[in-house]
Interface confidence: low
């Protein structure tokens, strides 16, 4: 709130702390049930008993942690990504499904492909979809690897998206891609599987193009129908969208203030 | 500052607009002075008559448009930041330089090399060093082509500094890549001569690696020894730094309010 | 966005930027700047009513969290949000410089 | 920076990042949240002196003017610079529902 | 302006049923939450329940097994259904709306009607 | 559940007296606390919430103050028409919301 008045300008009056945590602490209520569209805390009556489901603690745990790659948050646009996103995530189709046997082994390439019918279960429209991140677990790694990723196109052709270089290391370290764009396309068309090429960097005279970084969900010869899944640790996109029924809310209000 | 009673946090006394543009304004004046670490206007006794000279008018513009590649301002660091940098601008050693001779001719790639006794002329110390661009005129362009710049390392190793995917374009256009850290060590190093290599982004599958972007500076053969430079628009640093004297004033004055 | 699009052809009495150009001659008496000549500065201006009262419906007070008190904060502020440098050109000496000073034009504000 | 390492081990008077820990059941009274149990939410206090005033000795002024009124603003205010989110489990009905929540922990603050 | 009127209140016997109503008007009925309070004669007042304006409702302990409270936003209209009446009971019972600005002060009791008395005697 | 102590359950007091009544949480209730006036065959009327925050209308001689357990109402002044029983609540997701007992302000 402006103050108009020189004297406020340059003196400040003493601070009850206690006041303005309070303060703080009563908007922080407000900010959380807005954030949410709630009017007020949700009843908990159907909660069923025990602790959180395994799922949904992992689910917890890679949004909470920060990632290799993932950059601090953006500064947001300010209506839509005010509000709360729900976070999903959908896991990459199991390796000895049909859909690898397309694609030749290869010493420089790795192939992850994901069914859009779960990514629509997940996020019905692609409008509501405000983050898409790739998160590969990268084991341990010997030599220094410029990897580079690529998104399916048609007629098997692949688009270069980004890159990354990754330092060697001892224990394993999940790597994120922000593929937002692409996943919203995905949500846009009608293909039933769509997919990513995690591929060694090849410089035009380079003669070694071989991808050293050993990706979990596949065992070190790549070989996609010999592939060994480690639990839930494969390869996984985690969704961050608006739900459906908080978009609608949010269509409807579209006024300024 | 904090405003500690509850009636100024939810209500707003009238707003003199003109008694807080006169604020601003005053503001302002001490910000621009204090940013430059002047305590008064500069003395105009011995500035010379007549226009601004032509470089100084093309390093202003330089500096004043935003080009393609270019990210908006980041969030400065808050003290070094927020002093004035000042703005220099050091061309592309010249193409009949022996020192395109070591490096073959290739239909991937250009090179370009700097002097880096003008990088230290214009930069004293690497600390002072905020951001350093290299800028290039890329002329006309026909197909969407992928490049990456890479940095000469020592035995005319190359490594990979970034990417960029450029548009099919009838105008030329400037493109600028951030290399700050590779000027800084340059800075640091003993060496001469240092340079940069822009190539077309080669897959390991792929077969056309030609660079069709022609960049202002190059003749479209890309020979070296032939190569006309047209004018100023050859490939440049353009560079941030706080001056020496601002830095000096700064170290001494390292302590906190 | 409370950016100068939406504020500089709306009446918005809360937070918004402010136009505000500065000619260096005639506001500040400065002849020492050779280029520019001025610059659109602009500020932030309006009040971010703190919406934690009675007499605010509370679907309404849902709604405008976002913008009067989108940070929570114990008494919200208008700031700028999106900011940009401004290149001079001025003379030390018989010295051309071009220097850059940042944060200097202000594009959006923010209750924050 | 006035960030959490700095203003955290000091007694800075002026504008700072302070610390401030969020328990969602002793300071909310909220039973909803299954994660986490609170957070680290802080906030930003302190005055931004206004500085560019005759009786203030000029050259400090000028050392000052980046800490009090780095944005030239007509009446600086104290308002967080870095935020960061904050990730949420709880249940609507039997579902359980993961969801980020944007710009919900301040690490550092800014007279703007 | 804001009105709350309480009504059903009388004499009824032990053990019997009871069915109190609060019609709102004023304010948007159906955006609010409220709640019933009651106070017996000369003592202090008691909290008995709250609902939401979903129809979530909770109870203090002492109310749960016999008393129910429910809601017709389409009547504007707030109900406390009373079963099993005891002597002690006897109270006068008061609706109130609840100030429920951020899910939290909506049991603050912001605005309260005027009562309606109930003496459950033999 | 949460009990609420309500000090003094009586007073006696003149026009112009500053009165002081204290309510004690048996656990810690941040600064969930409003407190009522209410006068002979009137419904209570909210004075305070939140501990400290003054309902609109209110007069300011009216002040409430504390956090935790211990929490107080102040009448800085004591005018004529401010005699009456004052009572103090607790409230807190998921718990009961509990009244003090009530304290009686009375004509010295």
């Known amino acids: 709130d402006y103050k108009d008045d020189d004297d406020k300008l340059s003196t400040s009056k003493t601070i009850d702390m206690e006041l303005v945590k309070r303060k703080r602490i009563e908007a922080i209520r407000g900010q959380i049930l807005s954030k949410l569209r709630l009017a007020s805390p949700p009843s908990q009556g159907e909660v069923p008993p025990g602790p959180l489901p395994e799922a949904v603690l992992a689910l917890y745990n890679s949004t909470r942690d920060r990632v290799a790659g993932e950059s601090a948050e953006p500064e947001p646009e300010p209506e839509a990504d005010y509000y709360a996103k729900e976070v999903t995530r959908v896991l990459m189709v199991e390796t000895h499904n049909e859909i690898y046997d397309k694609f030749k082994q290869s010493t420089h390439s790795i192939y992850m492909f994901f069914n859009t019918s779960e990514l629509r279960e997940a996020v019905p429209e692609p409008v509501l979809l405000s983050r898409a991140e790739l998160r590969l677990l990268r084991l341990k790694l010997k030599v220094e690897q410029h990897v580079e990723l690529y998104q399916k196109y048609s007629n098997n052709s692949w688009r270069y998206l980004s890159n990354r270089l990754l330092a060697p290391s001892d224990s394993p370290e999940w790597l994120s891609f922000d593929v937002t764009g692409v996943v919203r396309q995905w949500l846009s068309r009608g293909g039933e599987i769509e997919g990513f090429r995690l591929s060694a960097h090849c410089s035009c005279d380079s003669k070694d193009n071989t991808l050293q970084v050993d990706i979990n969900g596949f065992t070190t010869g790549r070989r996609g129908d010999l592939a060994t899944i480690h639990g839930m640790n494969r390869p996984f996109l985690l969704l961050m969208a608006t739900p459906l029924e908080r978009a609608q809310h949010l269509q409807s209000s579209r006024h300024r203030r | 500052d904090y405003k500690d009673d509850d009636d100024k946090l939810s209500t707003s006394k009238t707003i003199d607009m003109e008694l807080v543009k006169r604020k601003r304004i005053e503001a302002i004046r001490g910000q621009i002075l204090s940013k430059l670490r002047l305590a008064s206007p500069p003395s105009q006794g011995e500035v010379p008559p007549g226009p601004l000279p032509e470089a100084v008018l093309a390093l202003y513009n330089s500096t004043r448009d935003r080009v393609a590649g270019e990210s908006a301002e980041p969030e400065p660091e808050p003290e070094a930041d927020y002093y004035a940098k000042e703005v220099t601008r050091v061309l592309m050693v010249e193409t009949h330089n022996e020192i395109y001779d070591k490096f073959k001719q290739s239909t991937h790639s250009i090179y370009m090399f700097f002097n880096t006794s003008e990088l230290r002329e214009a930069v004293p110390e690497p600390v002072l060093l905020s951001r350093a661009e290299l800028r290039l005129l890329r002329l006309k362009l026909k197909v969407e082509q992928h490049v990456e710049l890479y940095q000469k390392y020592s035995n005319n190793s190359w490594r990979y500094l970034s990417n960029r995917l450029l548009a099919p374009s009838d105008s030329p256009e400037w493109l600028s890549f951030d290399v700050t850290g590779v000027v800084r060590q340059w800075l640091s190093r003993g060496g001469e001569i240092e340079g940069f290599r822009l190539s077309a982004h080669c897959s390991c599958d792929s077969k056309d690696n030609t660079l069709q972007v022609d960049i202002n500076g190059f003749t479209t053969g890309r020979r070296g020894d032939l190569a006309t430079i047209h004018g100023m628009n050859r490939p440049f640093l353009l560079l941030m730094a706080t001056p020496l004297e601002r830095a000096q004033h700064l170290q001494s004055s390292r302590h906190r309010r | 966005a409370l950016d100068t699009n939406y504020c500089f052809s709306s009446t918005e009495k809360n937070c918004c930027v402010r136009q505000l150009y500065i000619d260096f001659r005639k506001d500040l008496g400065w002849k020492w700047i050779h280029e520019p000549k001025g610059y659109h500065a602009n500020f932030c201006l309006g009040p971010c009513p703190y919406i934690w009262s009675l007499d605010t419906q509370y679907s309404k007070v849902l709604a405008l969290y976002n913008q009067h008190n989108p940070g929570a904060s114990a008494a919200p502020c208008c700031v700028p949000q999106a900011l940009e440098p401004l290149p001079i050109v001025y003379y030390v000496g018989r010295k051309p410089k071009v220097e850059q000073l940042s944060n200097m034009i202000v594009r959006s504000c923010k209750c924050s | 920076a006035l960030d959490t390492n700095y203003c955290f081990s000091s007694t800075e008077k002026n504008c700072c990042v302070r610390q401030l820990y969020i328990d969602f059941r002793k300071d909310l009274g909220w039973k909803w949240i299954h994660e986490p149990k609170g957070y680290h939410a802080n906030f930003c206090l302190g005055p931004c002196p206004y500085i560019w005033s005759l009786d203030t000795q000029y050259s400090k002024v000028l050392a000052l003017y980046n800490q009090h009124n780095p944005g030239a603003s007509a009446a600086p205010c104290c308002v967080p610079q870095a935020l960061e989110p904050l990730p949420i489990v709880y249940y609507v009905g039997r579902k359980p529902k993961v969801e980020q929540l944007s710009n919900m922990i301040v690490r550092s603050c800014k007279c703007s | 302006q804001v009105q709350l009127v309480e009504s059903g209140g009388g004499v009824v016997q032990p053990g019997r049923s009871l069915r109190l109503s609060c019609a709102a008007s004023?304010?948007?009925?159906?955006?609010?939450?409220m709640n019933w309070i009651r106070q017996p004669p000369g003592k202090g007042l008691e909290w008995i329940g709250y609902?939401?304006?979903?129809?979530?409702?909770y109870r203090a302990n002492w109310a749960r097994g016999r008393f129910t409270i429910s809601r017709d936003n389409s009547k504007n209209t707030l109900y406390l259904q009373m079963n099993s009446l005891r002597a002690e009971d006897t109270a006068v019972y008061y609706c109130?709306?609840?100030?429920?600005?951020?899910?939290?002060?909506?049991?603050?009791?912001?605005?309260w009607g005027q009562g309606t008395l109930v003496t459950v005697s033999s | 559940d949460i009990q609420m102590t309500q000090s003094p359950s009586s007073l006696s007091a003149s026009v112009g007296d500053r009165v002081t009544i204290t309510c004690q949480a048996s656990?810690?209730?941040?600064?969930?606390v409003a407190w009522y006036q209410q006068k002979p065959g009137q419904p209570p009327k909210l004075l305070i919430y939140?501990?400290?925050t003054l309902e609109s209308g209110v007069p300011s001689r009216f002040s409430g103050s504390g956090s935790g357990t211990d929490f107080t109402l102040t009448i800085s002044s004591l005018q004529p028409e401010d005699f009456a029983t004052y009572y103090c609540?607790?409230?807190?997701?998921?718990?009961?919301?509990?009244f003090g007992q009530g304290t009686k302000v009375e004509i010295k």
């Open positions: 609902i939401y304006t979903t129809g979530t409702t």
């Open positions: 656990q810690r209730i941040s600064t969930y």
């Open positions: 109130a709306r609840g100030w429920h600005i951020f899910g939290h002060h909506y049991w603050v009791m912001h605005f």
């Open positions: 939140a501990a400290s």
């Open positions: 609540q607790s409230y807190s997701d998921g718990d009961s919301v509990i």
């Open positions: 004023g304010f948007h009925f159906s955006n609010e939450a």
